[in-house]
Amino acid sequence: ARNGDHCPLGPGRCCRLHTVRASLEDLGWADWVLSPREVQVTMCIGACPSQFRAANMHAQIKTSLHRLKPDTVPAPCCVPASYNPMVLIQKTDTGVSLQTYDDLLAKDCHCI
Amino acid sequence: ARNGDHCPLGPGRCCRLHTVRASLEDLGWADWVLSPREVQVTMCIGACPSQFRAANMHAQIKTSLHRLKPDTVPAPCCVPASYNPMVLIQKTDTGVSLQTYDDLLAKDCHCI
């Protein structure tokens, strides 16, 4: 259950999709990827206050226990709920190849 | 790819499965769950240093960008990779029912 999408901390402060521009050097890919040379990395960033975009029952439990034992149990964390595919042109021993990665760029976020 | 399981921060400091004892009151379930009255909640807790139990390519990217932009990009987070089912005896309008929850207790952890 995707619980409340209203962020009590203020607009843009809670778990959501962000885009971060990164070069191949930034990603540590410069020696095996040829294209694209700049990646618009979509990732999940932001706080997960009580019941905000709770992914499942486990996230709800975590929220409850974090409230009780904040030093022991961390708050839920903002992570990808799904991914977008991305195609890379890679170097190979014989030349180049196109490879699709299905777990590289976040499409949607939730708290868990 | 489940990367290195060696924790560079010392034994037990990195992302792993922990068990937290919780009552129905702790969980906010006292008014709808009859049994069990105490739950051994298994959850994922711990740090996610570089490439430790990286769940996928996205986790690897996140590690790289966190190193470059620690104020913008958070480190990967320790979350369940899979769940164990749990059966609850619940109150219903007509009496009680057994309900299985598949997303309640963490079984295995990774960093994402």
Epitope: S35, P36, T42, I89 | -
Partner: antibody, heavy 119, light 112 residues
Framework: QVQLVQSGAEVKKPGASVKVSCKAS????EGWYIHWVRQAPGQGLE????????????NHAQKFQGRVTMTRDTSISTAYMELSRLRSDDTAVYYC????????????WGQGTMVTVSS | EIVLTQSPATLSLSPGERATLSCRSS???????????LDWYQQKPGQAPRLLIY???NRAHGIPARFSGSGSGTDFTLTISSLEPEDFAVYYC?????????FGQGTKVEIK
């Protein structure tokens, strides 16, 4: 199969706007960039810009600054290119094409949309 | 912006002959690992362009072996080892080394 299908030919008056659509099928729309290229009658190819369907971010040639808008609707795997304040020298065939990024070759092209600007 | 100059403007040859098309760049298109951000396209009347060669020397999917690309830095060549009747068309080189992406003015390969 993998293809890009564009909207039909348009005839516009100078000063008007035109919006060309490009529907992708047979591949994950958000995994590839959409580029726009035009070709005036009897002339060569001219790159206009790109749209990253994953993020909605765009980039275009300086020549089209303030006149071109590139958008997308991921729910129907369609990219759009709108050109405003049309002039007679905008008469051309407009193509969409896909590439793995901003700097990649265009491996699949739409069939082209003829836009005629005439008073 | 990078200017690409193709020569000759027109090439008159017979089927079975070898075609050599040139593309010269106003600046180097060489990136790391010895790859150049130069591609070749074929266009027939009333049709969209078709990718032949990408990253200076890699044949696109389904392109016959008689097409080959070579060169580095600022000077590039597309070679058609033995012209088939369907090869008579206009050929464009394109650079994606930097924005704006630019094309050469084209070389028309016509039947002698």
């Amino acid at each position: 199969q993998v293809q890009l299908v564009q909207s039909g030919a348009e005839v516009k008056k100078p000063g008007a706007s035109v919006k060309v659509s490009c529907k992708a099928s047979g591949y994950p729309f958000e995994g590839w960039y959409i580029h726009w290229v035009r070709q005036a009658p009897g002339q060569g190819l001219e790159w206009m810009g790109w749209n990253n369907p994953r993020t909605g971010l765009t980039n275009h040639a300086q020549k089209f600054q303030g006149r071109v808008t590139m958008t997308r609707d991921t729910s129907i795997s369609t990219a759009y290119m709108e050109l405003s304040r049309l002039r007679s020298d905008d008469t051309a065939v407009y193509y969409c094409a896909r590439g793995v990024g901003a700097d990649a070759a265009f491996d699949i092209w739409g069939q082209g949309t003829m836009v005629t600007v005439s008073s | 912006e990078i200017v690409l100059t193709q020569s000759p403007a027109t090439l008159s040859l017979s089927p079975g002959e070898r075609a050599t098309l040139s593309c010269r760049s106003s600046q180097s298109l060489l990136w790391k690992h010895g790859y150049n951000y130069l591609d070749w396209y074929q266009q027939k009347p009333g049709q969209a362009p078709r990718l032949l060669i990408y990253l200076d020397r890699n044949r696109a999917h389904g392109i016959p072996a008689r097409f080959s690309g070579s060169g580095s830095g600022t000077d590039f060549t597309l070679t058609i080892s033995s012209l088939e009747p369907e090869d008579f068309a206009v050929y464009y080189c394109m650079q994606s080394f930097e924005t704006p992406i630019t094309f050469g003015q084209g070389t028309k390969v016509e039947i002698k």
